[in-house]
Amino acid sequence: ATKLTEEKYELKEGQTLDVKCDYTLEKFASSQKAWQIIRDGEMPKTLACTERPSKNSHPVQVGRIILEDYHDHGLLRVRMVNLQVEDSGLYQCVIYQPPKEPHMLFDRIRLVVTKGFSGTPGSNENSTQNVYKIPPTTTKALCPLYTSPRTVTQAPPKSTADVSTPDSEINLTNVTDIIRVPVFN
């Protein structure tokens, strides 16, 4: 069996996780993609998914999670804003490919969110929290429910699956950008 590897990221409450998951462009550009959490002893749970077929660069927001699939680059950008301590856990990007089970994109992400200000050099430590204005977006497709012997992904609660968000406000203080693919200049 393939050994599953993890990348660990330690962030502070209020920061933003910004991950780019790369996939094989030719095979998966239009495939529906999802962001999942894997809790100890439980099957992976789908927190958010792109539309089906996945639209190029179309932002899909579910709560504090924003997904953007960039077909030109074979990259799924995942942002989790206003991180909370309880967001700590193991996450993964997957590609839905029914009737086969989801294809996991390496590596898994071990997120550790701790309390306290980030103290990022150059950031304003005395500033009050800033408001993150989420533009209205709508996800048309429900995240599918899979039940396979090795991997099960559950659909999120109904309230988060079919979302229309009119100017939600999320408190946000800082962002840590995680680039998991090479960037050329």
Epitope: T16, D18, N56, S57, E68, Y70, H71, D72, H73, L75, R77, V81, G122, N130, V131, Y132, K133, L172, T173, N174, V175, T176, D177, V183, F184, N185
Partner: antibody
Framework: QVQLQESGPGLVKPSETLSLTCAVS?????????WAWIRQPPGKGLEWIGS???????YYNPSLKSRVTISVDTSKNQFSLKLSSVTAADTAVYYC??????????????WGQGTLVTVSS | EIVMTQSPATLSVSPGERATLSCRAS??????LAWYQQKPGQAPRLLIY???TRATGIPARFSGSGSGTEFTLTISSLQSEDFAVYYC?????????FGGGTKVEIK
């Protein structure tokens, strides 16, 4: 080095369509990067109009989206801007520029020298 | 869209002095911020991208710092050719947005 040169009419009548072309030299558009149009009304600040990738994927400023079309011609190594239903408020210096390699690396370098487009009857 | 606010609108500095320009984003943009210099009748010139990386050919007296929502451009010792308008721009998400600019003038 990479150079960009805007061309197109300097005077457009209200309600007509503004059309500009940006010729790129020293770099092949099809090699990557985003290519952008930015404008600057006289005495004012900068406004991003939109960007295009060599694949043809386009990204527009929502404030202009209904009127803007950006296209690319890789065979001529150029990209173009069309802005419909123009008014006096669209009078500006229009710049073309090379963006970054990814959507989140959207800085602009280098820039064309800019071309002033006046909307007037 | 993300609103970028620059301050001050005008900065009067003597040659050889240090200039500090500020830029604030209405929401966090990580380190995805650029700075440009524009002189009258010219196109803007990229100085800094990624909040702190100097563009090719930019003198070391220009430095950028900050992350999240608060950013600073510092010109350590102003030269005569540095008097211009400076713009910040977030390059994190569409639509890309610019600040209103800071004019650095001779005191």
């Amino acid at each position: 080095q990479v150079q960009l040169q805007e061309s197109g009419p300097g005077l457009v009548k209200p309600s007509e369509t503004l059309s500009l072309t940006c010729a790129v030299s020293g770099y092949s558009i099809s090699s990557g990067y985003y290519w952008a149009w930015i404008r600057q009304p006289p005495g004012k600040g900068l406004e991003w109009i939109g960007s295009i990738y060599h694949s043809g994927s386009t990204y527009y400023n929502p404030s202009l989206k209904s009127r803007v079309t950006i296209s690319v011609d890789t065979s001529k190594n150029q990209f173009s801007l069309k802005l419909s239903s123009v008014t006096a408020a669209d009078t500006a210096v229009y710049y073309c520029a090379r963006g970054g390699p990814y959507p989140w690396s959207g800085w602009f370098d280098p820039w064309g020298q800019g071309t002033l487009v006046t909307v007037s009857s | 869209e993300i609103v970028m606010t620059q301050s001050p609108a005008t900065l009067s500095v003597s040659p050889g002095e240090r200039a500090t320009l500020s830029c604030r984003a209405s929401q966090s943009v990580g380190s995805n911020l650029a700075w440009y210099q524009q002189k009258p009748g010219q196109a803007p010139r990229l100085l800094i991208y990624g909040a702190s990386t100097r563009a090719t050919g930019i003198p070391a007296r220009f430095s950028g710092s900050g992350s999240g929502t608060e950013f600073t451009l510092t010109i350590s010792s102003l030269q005569s050719e540095d008097f211009a308008v400076y713009y910040c721009q977030q390059h994190d998400v569409w639509p890309y947005t610019f600040g209103g600019g800071t004019k650095v003038e001779i005191k």
